[in-house]
Interface confidence: medium
């Protein structure tokens, strides 16, 4: 970059990149200022004037330094089975998460949830695994010997059989052991 060139807009050395928070405008052939998060380019730069930035309008945002013609629209309001964990502001999009008992079946690229689904339930003989499916849904695993689950639930894990001094009925995957009364 020639030493005498410091303030935007300026013509860079051909093929060289502009500095941080600047962009190369192909039409003006200039390095020009980007707009800060929460703003957008109202007027693009020319050879003699820099980018004119303006604040994003209501329900719109930009999250990065940019030269966007318009701000991005915030995602629509969270649905009844979601909770808003981050509000829509000029600098960030709204983020919705699923309420308890639900998982996100369809995420947006920004990490918000577009569609929540009820968590799967594990039936008798199966407990909820410690890890989740890639989509966040519950994974069920068969109860190992010595453990059981007698519920249909999206939260219950396999529990150990009770330990009896005298066993009346041995437990299995879906029922607990039954102890004989002590005489």
């Amino acid at each position: 970059l020639p030493a005498q060139v410091a303030f935007t807009p300026y013509a860079p050395e051909p093929g060289s990149t502009c500095r941080l928070r600047e962009y190369y405008d192909q039409t003006a052939q200039m390095c020009c200022s980007k707009c800060s998060p929460g703003q957008h380019a109202k007027v693009f730069c020319t050879k003699t004037s820099d980018t004119v930035c303006d604040d994003c309008e209501a329900s719109m945002y930009t999250q990065v330094w940019n030269q966007f013609r318009t701000c991005l629209s915030c995602s629509s309001s969270c649905t009844t089975d979601q909770v808003e964990i981050r509000a829509c502001t000029k600098q960030q999009n709204r983020v919705c998460a699923c309420e308890a008992g639900r998982y996100c079946a369809l995420k947006t690229h920004s990490g918000s949830c577009r569609q929540c689904m009820r968590l799967s339930k594990c039936g008798p003989g199966f407990g909820v695994a410690s890890s989740r499916a890639p989509n966040g849904n519950v994974l069920c695993k068969a109860c190992a010997p010595g453990t059981f689950s007698d519920t249909t639930s999206s939260t219950d894990v396999c529990r150990p059989h009770r330990i009896c001094s005298i066993l009346a009925i041995p437990g299995n995957a879906s029922t607990d052991a039954v102890c004989a009364p002590e005489s």
Epitope: P2, A11, E13, P14, G15, Y24, Q26, T27, Q29, K47
Partner: antibody
Amino acid sequence: QIQLVQSGAEVKKPGASVKVSCKASGYTFTTYGMSWVRQAPGQGLEWMGWIHTYSGVPTYADDFKGRFAFTLDTSTSTAYMELRSLRSDDTAVYYCARGLYGVDYWGQGTLVTVSS
Amino acid sequence: EIVMTQSPATLSLSPGERATLSCKASENVVTYVSWYQQKPGQAPRLLIYGASNRYTGIPARFSGSGSATDFTLTISSLQPEDFAVYYCGQSYTYPYTFGQGTKLEIK
């Protein structure tokens, strides 16, 4: 390294069309505009216009409006120059060139010969 | 359109001599002038951009000066490989235009 590789020489009859390609490599294609320059045999350089490689919007010099079309395929980092209704005075070497303010990289040129 | 007029059309000099090539614009183009060298059968090569900035890798014997309408390319001590055609071009306003060229030949 940065390269602009153009398609090979063409011999066409008057009235025909020709499409010259210019494949870019070694840099981010959509950052720099692509200019097109014509040079008739033994003559100087003529700026035909350019295409904004991010938006795809072309700009043509007055003498090159109508029969000329600049297009892009950003998926392959290739710019195209199409010339319709060829005439004998279109015989020239056609160059693609990166940028506008100080054109720093040029294709090797494509000779288009129009002859009946 | 802006007309770029180069002079002389042909310049005959010997290796080691100083070459001064002129380019005049019909209107003010600020400093939006580039200089290119072209040898037979080759594409042009960028030498100077912004009227006075030497492009990367260009030898120091090449220098550019001027602003507004009068521009000069100077080659301080000609080398055998410098004999070629030189073009100036403006990129200030559409349509961008080139001069007709100056042929630098060995005397």
